[in-house]
């Protein structure tokens, strides 16, 4: 007779990443008895919520419940019913909601309130919805990739379990690009972190880490594009704007009200006597790059060295995992290979941006035009941000690894967030007091 399989002793956790452009739900699973081991939690599901980011629901909060339904129902299906009540659900909102809160705390609270009420209706253990700080977003992204890469494990292995593993315990830096913000987080080499706001101290698995992190609000790819357009229309003073960041032959009408809707364009705002203007693409990488650089103020630095806008940045150290939009954009452009040099990436971008729009539409017929039209800008922006913003060089470029998933789990802040909130990263190596949430932030 066949033995009956013993019921799995596993646990689940759900994290919703409420980003500026969309919301994604992640389901994580781990063996219950190995909670404090490193590398045991893995992602079993990702569900992308149809529609925009939650900050866009400010005028239609009543639609939030329906918006979240499909993915929450998917979670109900994936997680065994017996586990529902003990499965924690966390929602973390990032820069899109940070921007909304800057405009109106009341409106941001209203959105979060409706989100909380909607999520409370499900049979899971809802733990709350909150806007996480940029510092947390950077820190949790760093924790995620290093946890998945096995960097917190004290056991040095003679074999490599992940493609990026270098068999040493040197942590990877984390580069995260969203729609509204971008984060850089790494352990500097014997360098004092000159600005306290950018310093984090962790004790994880018995080891101390002094981590540098900064989140640049308004420098996610979507908000950077709005900034660039607002800057350019100010200089152009014209109803038509030739834009080197869009393909030759591309045309798009932009509403001035949309342009000035975001706090990110406030510094460029001027009274324009027209309600709309037309972008005409001219597809020139070099000129696009030049135009993007004007968004980075590098003339002011009160520290020994800065990234841009007067923000301290220590000398880059070690390898970096570049994920989220860094990965999605570079993957689309077929530039994620470790073998592709920075010079080659630049060459490819020059060719790509110069391709006529009609040709691009034909070559990528399955891609939504809204996204397709912005890859020239996004790719150029990534290069500008990494090279001029963060001071990577042609040589240090090879230390950037564009990562989508590690061991089947998405690189991003959500896993680190859940590990922390469920106390699954102990401060000490043996079974000991777990790290409290307040230790982080």
């Amino acid at each position: 007779t066949q033995n009956k399989a013993l019921p799995e002793n596993v646990k689940y956790g759900i994290v919703l990443d409420a980003g500026s452009s969309h919301t994604s739900l992640y389901i994580y699973k781990w063996p219950a008895e190995k909670e404090n081991d490193t590398g045991v939690v893995h992602q079993v599901e990702e569900c992308r919520v149809k529609g925009p980011g939650i900050s866009k629901f400010v005028q239609k909060v009543n639609e939030i419940g329906i918006y979240l339904t499909d993915c929450m129902e998917r979670a109900r299906e994936v997680i065994p019913r017996s586990q529902h009540q003990e499965t924690p659900v966390y929602l973390g909102a990032t820069a899109g909601m940070r921007l909304l809160r800057m405009e109106s705390e009341e409106l941001a609270d209203r959105v979060l309130d409706v989100v909380e009420r909607s999520l409370s209706n499900y049979p899971f253990d809802f733990q709350g919805a909150r806007i996480i700080t940029g510092q947390e977003e950077g820190a949790y992204g760093w924790i995620t990739i290093n946890y998945l890469l096995g960097k917190f494990s004290q056991k040095t292995r003679w074999f490599s379990i992940v493609p990026y593993e270098t068999n040493n315990q040197e942590t990877f830096g984390a580069l995260d690009l969203g729609g509204a913000s971008t984060q850089v987080t790494f352990v500097p080499q014997n360098q004092t972190i000159e600005s306290p706001d950018n310093a984090l101290q962790f004790r994880l698995y018995g080891k101390d880490y002094n981590v540098y992190t900064h989140s640049f609000l308004c420098y996610g790819k979507d908000q950077a594009l709005w900034q660039k357009l607002a800057k350019d229309i100010q200089v152009a003073s014209n109803e038509i704007l030739r834009d080197p960041c869009f393909h030759p032959g591309y045309k798009k009408v932009v509403n001035v009200s949309d342009l000035y809707k975001t706090p990110c364009t406030k510094r460029f705002e001027m009274t324009l006597p027209f309600q709309q203007f037309e972008i005409q693409g001219i597809g020139n990488y070099q000129q696009c790059h030049q135009s993007i650089l004007e968004l980075f103020n590098t003339s002011y630095c009160p520290y020994s060295q800065c990234a841009f806008n007067g923000i301290f940045l220590p000398p880059l150290q070690g390898d970096f995992g570049a994920f989220s939009a860094f990965y999605f954009v570079m993957k689309f452009l077929n530039l994620t290979s470790e073998k592709v040099s920075q010079e080659k990436v630049t060459e490819m971008m020059k060719k790509f941006c110069a391709q006529p729009w009609e040709e691009i539409k034909t070559s990528y017929a399955g891609v939504k035009e809204k996204y397709l039209s912005e890859y020239c800008f996004s790719g150029t922006y990534i290069l500008s941000l990494l090279l001029q913003g963060y001071h990577f060089t042609a040589d240090s470029w090879e230390h950037i690894h564009f990562i989508g998933k590690i061991q089947g789990s998405d690189a991003g802040w959500t896993l680190g967030y859940m590990l922390n909130l469920t106390n699954m990263i102990p401060a000490e190596q043996p079974l000991s007091t777990p790290l409290s949430h307040s230790t982080y932030v």
Partner: antibody, heavy 119, light 107 residues
Framework: EVQLVESGGGLVKPGGSLKLPCAAS????????MHWVRQAPEKGLEWVAY????????YYADTVKGRFTISRDNAKNTLFLQMTSLRSEDTAMYYC????????????WGQGTTLTVAS | DIQMTQSPSSLSASLGERVSLTCRAS??????LIWLQQKPDGTIKRLIY???TLDSGVPKRFSGNRSGSDYSLTISSLESEDFADYYC?????????FGGGTKLEIK
């Protein structure tokens, strides 16, 4: 081939008026902002006025504000500079130039037309 | 208004010589600067835009550079047709303002 041709210059008495046209060809005139720039004898270039493609944005130099009016007729591909209350210091060569950010900022200029204000 | 201070106001140089003209902006203009050449017959031609981008058809001996608020036009090896007047113009804000000009003469 892009061409800008100014005309209408001449001798005008102080306090008088004159309208300078600039005829454009070889490009989509209605897409471009247009400028008037002048140069007094033996002097440098001086920006005078600007009009956007749809005429919704207009700027003037302080020296001509209230006396000069820039306008355009997109159907006729023509730019105009109406000058009133002319003074001797308005004596100059007047140039028109086209403008379209990013790469066409004052990239083509006319050959100029001479205005002399004297009694 | 943004003042553009151009130097030198005149310059005598020989064929084959390397020359540099400079414009200094009184306020931040973020690279929004063009260089123009005016021939003795009054013809005006744009050479460089966005501080350093060479116009198509302009010889490679011309180059534009930016260092902080200083902008320069360099001609690496003078040719006879380069003797003319040169102007910089900022297009960061209105009113648009020109530098005072540089008269480049043959020595």
């Amino acid at each position: 081939e892009v061409q800008l041709v100014e005309s209408g210059g001449g001798l005008v008495k102080p306090g008088g008026s004159l309208k300078l046209p600039c005829a454009a060809s070889g490009f989509t005139f209605s897409d471009y902002g247009m400028h008037w720039v002048r140069q007094a004898p033996e002097k440098g270039l001086e920006w005078v006025a600007y009009i956007s493609s749809g005429s919704s944005i207009i700027y003037y130099a302080d020296t001509v504000k209230g006396r000069f009016t820039i306008s355009r007729d997109n159907a006729k591909n023509t730019l105009f500079l109406q000058m009133t209350s002319l003074r001797s210091e308005d004596t100059a060569m007047y140039y028109c130039a086209r403008d379209l950010y990013y790469d066409h900022v004052l990239d083509y200029w006319g050959q100029g037309t001479t205005l002399t204000v004297a009694s | 208004d943004i003042q553009m201070t151009q130097s030198p106001s005149s310059l005598s140089a020989s064929l084959g010589e390397r020359v540099s003209l400079t414009c200094r902006a009184s306020q931040e203009i973020s690279g929004y600067l063009i260089w123009l050449q005016q021939k003795p017959d009054g013809t005006i031609k744009r050479l460089i835009y966005a501080a350093s981008t060479l116009d198509s058809g302009v010889p490679k001996r011309f180059s534009g550079n930016r260092s902080g608020s200083d902008y320069s036009l360099t001609i690496s090896s003078l040719e006879s047709e380069d003797f003319a007047d040169y102007y910089c113009l900022q297009y960061a804000s209105y009113p648009r303002t020109f530098g005072g000009g540089t008269k480049l003469e043959i020595k």
